[in-house]
């Protein structure tokens, strides 16, 4: 149920885009292709580039994206495709002038002299978004997520912009400097991966972003699990990013009782961040448990 | 720059048919390709388009009756099993660029057509 | 759905106007391109993105976007009888799916 053909606007292309990455990343870290045979992920792959293929058509001038080609270009939907296209980048050719071009239109269009990064135009499909929704630490959760997306877009595209790396630092800055008043579970989620990613997640910080978890086990707001699931998977790749091993197990036995294999409405964000935290953990965790988790693939009839 | 089309001929219904856009001055790794047809006295029609990676898409009505590929200097348009509402001049067309700057997705180098009749 | 009317006609050195409706769907959200064809012959952009002219294009030929109306207009001012032909809009609604309007005959009279 997780390999979907894409299509619609610049949104809906993406949403639908998204668990087909995710279940082709997972299988892949987790070598189970076996279980489902090696011509279904040849089948994903297409879905994939059809998916890259039909994006760009959303791709504009500036090498921003928006839901529609005369829409404004939106600062989470442009960070988004950055966050997928790098994970693709394995997967499928995709041009670097594309991903590169949208990592640095984020830089210099939309991040402040204070390393915040601004939206000034939201996206439509908001239940895409995730934990983001309606959140009233904003600026840290927007800031978190743009920040892990060029990240992830580093190493392909440092390079070709200049200006990454200092932004990047900027943007830490930031987190770390707001950090501790964090109210919301899933924003000490999200921004403590940021930071674990640049080995800033330390000292008060990090006991911060620990004392957090209810029951040691999860990263909840009162609301949507969805929303849970997401944050808790930001959460587990921070412990993964700082080999908290011990920490990890009860996490990822939390996620896994959760039963959610993804897909659904407002499911974008959930789908993507256990699958990418679940594949990590059974990559890096030494002698991790064996996840049963159900990946169904049933390839779309064309 | 320039696009032109060959192939078209008179074939018999259900007789599949080729048709061949050979293209000059520009390279097929840069720029997508449709292909547009005109029924004798009517309008265009959209039928499909391929991209430089490959991925091809058609309109609703010409999924499963169309097929196009490409080698590097040619776009092929298969008309699968022809009948006579196929007659028509086809049309091979460049789409502006690529990769997807969306303010330029429109057919900006058409060739001058082939007429394909499919008659009894 | 793009519709266009089938015919429309003007004098020589008048101004004509011809409309594409956008039946489903938002026009705000979509570029409009404009193409003439001659009889016999390949059509030639004269107007994409709802109001950029191709170079070799005279000014003479326009677009715009009417939002209320949820339509695309081409304008063509000082007609001459080389205008006389048949006009389509067409709209790229994503990078899989291009929608021609039907087509209006330009009939430029003495």
């Known amino acids: 149920h997780l390999i979907v053909t894409p299509s619609g606007c610049g949104e809906q292309n993406m949403i639908g885009m998204t668990p087909t990455v995710i279940a082709v990343h997972y299988l892949d870290e987790t070598e189970q292709w076996e279980k489902f045979g090696l011509e279904k992920r040849q089948g994903a792959l297409e879905l994939i580039k059809k998916g890259y293929t039909q994006q760009l058509a959303f791709r504009q001038p500036s090498s921003a994206f928006a839901a529609f080609v005369k829409r404004a270009p939106s600062t989470w939907l442009t960070a988004y495709v950055v966050k997928v296209f790098s994970l693709a980048v394995n997967l499928i050719a995709i041009d670097s002038q594309v991903l590169c071009g949208a990592v640095k239109w984020l830089i210099l269009e939309k991040q402040k002299p204070d390393g915040v990064f601004q939206e000034d135009a939201p996206v439509i499909h908001q239940e895409m978004i995730g934990g983001l929704r309606n959140n009233n630490e904003k600026d840290m959760a927007l800031t978190a997520f743009v920040l892990i997306s060029l990240q992830e877009a580093k190493d392909i595209c440092e390079e070709q912009v200049n200006s990454l790396p200092g932004s990047i630092t900027k943007a830490g800055d930031f987190l770390e400097a707001n950090y501790m008043n964090l109210q919301r579970s899933y924003t000490v989620a999200i921004a403590g991966y940021a930071l674990a990613q640049m080995g800033r997640l330390k000292g008060p910080l990090l006991n911060k972003f620990l004392t957090t978890a209810k029951d040691k086990n999860r990263w909840e707001d009162p609301g949507k699990q969805l929303y849970n699931v997401e944050a808790t998977s930001y959460a587990l790749l921070a412990l993964l990013q700082l080999k908290d091993f011990d920490f990890v197990p009860p996490v990822v036995r939390w996620l896994n009782e959760q039963r959610y294999y993804g897909g659904g409405y407002g499911s974008t964000q959930a789908t993507f961040m256990v699958f990418q935290a679940l594949a990590q953990y059974q990559k890096d965790a030494p002698d991790h448990q064996e996840l049963n988790l159900d990946v169904s693939l049933q390839l779309p009839s064309r | 720059q320039s696009v032109e089309e060959s192939g078209g001929r008179l074939v018999t219904p259900g007789t599949p048919l080729t048709l061949t856009c050979t293209v000059s001055?520009?390279?097929?790794?840069?720029?997508?390709m449709s292909w547009v047809r005109q029924a004798p006295g009517k309008g265009l029609e959209w039928i499909g388009i391929i991209y430089p990676n490959d991925i091809t898409y058609y309109a609703s009505w010409a999924k499963g009756r169309f097929t196009i590929s490409k080698t590097s200097t040619t776009v092929d348009l298969k008309i699968t099993s022809p009948t006579t509402e196929d007659t028509a001049t086809y049309f091979c067309?460049?789409?502006?660029?690529?990769?997807?700057?969306?303010?330029?997705?429109?057919?900006?180098?058409w060739g001058p057509g082939t007429l394909v009749t499919i008659s009894s | 759905v793009l519709t266009q009317p089938q015919s429309v006609s003007g004098s020589l050195g008048q101004t004509v106007s011809m409309s594409c409706k956008c039946d489903?769907?938002?026009?705000?959200?979509?570029?409009v391109h404009w193409y003439q064809q001659h009889p016999g012959k390949a059509p030639t952009t004269v107007i994409y993105n709802d109001d950029q002219r191709p170079s070799g294009v005279p000014d003479r030929f326009s677009g715009s976007i009417d939002s209320t109306s949820n339509s695309a207009s081409l304008t063509i001012t000082g007609l001459l009888a080389e205008d006389e032909a048949d006009y389509y809009c067409l709209s790229s609604v994503s990078s899989d799916n291009y929608v021609f309007g039907g087509g209006t005959q330009l009939t430029v009279t003495g």
């Open positions: 001055g520009f390279s097929l790794s840069s720029y997508a």
């Open positions: 489903s769907g938002n026009i705000d959200n979509y570029y």
């Open positions: 067309a460049r789409v502006v660029s690529w990769p997807g700057y969306t303010t330029e997705y429109y057919f900006n180098i």
